[in-house]
């Protein structure tokens, strides 16, 4: 699987999950989140050659099409597969609130 | 929705489904399929700017991150959303077989 275990410990050039830290205030302009100040969101990057973690029959077909037509603009793309939630704390007035933000952290990628 | 109805009738520059005809023999090297000779597979292409058909909370965050960090390599990607099957006919000896190939035709796209 193109997950953090494999991708973070390798120098994989093809589609893989990459490290990305997002600071809520600086990178998103969200000043109201109290904790955490930011988080390891990660992102997906890298080419999707034929047979590389292809998601559907269609992505297999497209990768094969690409092999026969190397200059074509139609190609599978490296996108998130498994996503995890992130708990945050913010204040409503003086009252702290804990919210679980769904689908915030990329754990693995796929070619789609 | 970034579907064939909208995308094929517009000159949309952002992520949208585009027309692509795949010839089984020429483009995939599949000589064994009897019917059809090829099909309209379509493909997804175009940038994924802020707010453009974002798939998950993560893709919203990434699009917002991109607005604050325009040079970043982390960005949502335009990929298939709705896929449809394709019926094919091939021969096993002299006996024709009909097979439904799942997820073969792109009907709409999303930014993931």
């Amino acid at each position: 699987a193109l997950d953090t275990n494999y991708c973070f410990s390798s120098t994989e050039k093809n589609c893989c999950v990459r490290q990305l830290y997002i600071d809520f205030r600086k990178d998103l302009g969200w000043k109201w989140i109290h904790e955490p100040k930011g988080y390891h969101a990660n992102f997906c990057l890298g080419p999707c050659p034929y047979i590389w973690s292809l998601d559907t029959q269609y992505s297999k077909v497209l990768a094969l099409y690409n092999q026969h037509n190397p200059g074509a603009s139609a190609a599978p793309c490296c996108v998130p597969q498994a996503l995890e939630p992130l708990p945050i704390v913010y204040y409503v007035g003086r009252k702290p609130k804990v919210e679980q933000l769904s689908n915030m952290i990329v754990r693995s990628c796929k070619c789609s | 929705a970034l579907d064939t109805n909208y995308c094929f009738s517009s000159t949309e520059k952002n992520c949208c489904v585009r027309q692509l005809y795949i010839d089984f023999r020429k483009d995939l090297g599949w000589k064994w399929i009897h019917e059809p000779k090829g099909y309209h597979a379509n493909f997804c292409l175009g940038p994924c700017p802020y707010i453009w058909s974002l798939d998950t909370q993560y893709s919203k965050v990434l699009a917002l991150y991109n607005q604050h960090n325009p040079g970043a390599s982390a960005a949502p990607c335009c990929v298939p959303q709705a896929l449809e099957p394709l019926p094919i006919v091939y021969y096993v000896g002299r006996k024709p077989k009909v097979e439904q190939l799942s997820n073969m035709i792109v009907r709409s796209c999303k930014c993931s």
């Epitope: 204040y91 003086r94 933000l101 | 707010i51």
Partner: antibody, heavy 121, light 107 residues
Amino acid sequence: EVQLVQSGAEVKKPGASVKVSCKTSGYIFMKYWMNWVRQAPGAGLDWMGQIFPAWGMTNYNEMFEGRVTLTADTSTSTAYMELSSLRAGDIAVYYCARGYGNYALDAMDYWGQGTLVTVSS
Amino acid sequence: DIVMTQTPPSLSVSPRETASISCRASESVDSYGNSFMHWYLQKPGQSPQLLIYLASNLESGVSDRFSGSGSGTDFTLRISRVEANDTGVYYCQQNDEDPLSFGQGTK
């Protein structure tokens, strides 16, 4: 230029629901909380609640007894306020107002033009 | 809930004079070194507009004839060299405690 443009005036029967829209432009919709405030004829301002559009996270004023529902559509940068079980006491101008951005509850720096809701049998 | 009480309920001021409006909160609205008190003006037939945030900060684009002061429970909005265009209802608002609340207004 930041703009919040609300839907037109509504006339509703008692017991019915009303849904008011607030279409925004000129800023990043997903960066700010959106508040809803109402003003009865000749009266002051009452805060109804707020939504953070990127997640649909909401905080409501208990005064509205669960009758108010706030939603947002990030694809069109539009916020919505639905008020159910309408009664005569709900006759008011309803405003959407953007939060200043430093806190969830905050000052409100941009306001819609207001939507008059009339309840009449 | 924090109750905001404004005085006076209405005020008539001659041009070029100074006007003062008071707002008293039923409990302190100070937290983390800030006073969570803001002031708005609602001109006839218009939506409210933010004048002062966090007790004393002038909102961008607002005339510097407006100034705010105070902390804890007692706050004041001052308008110097009053103009006819300043006519309207002035509201204070706190966001230190949920629910956010407004004063009843000073006309």
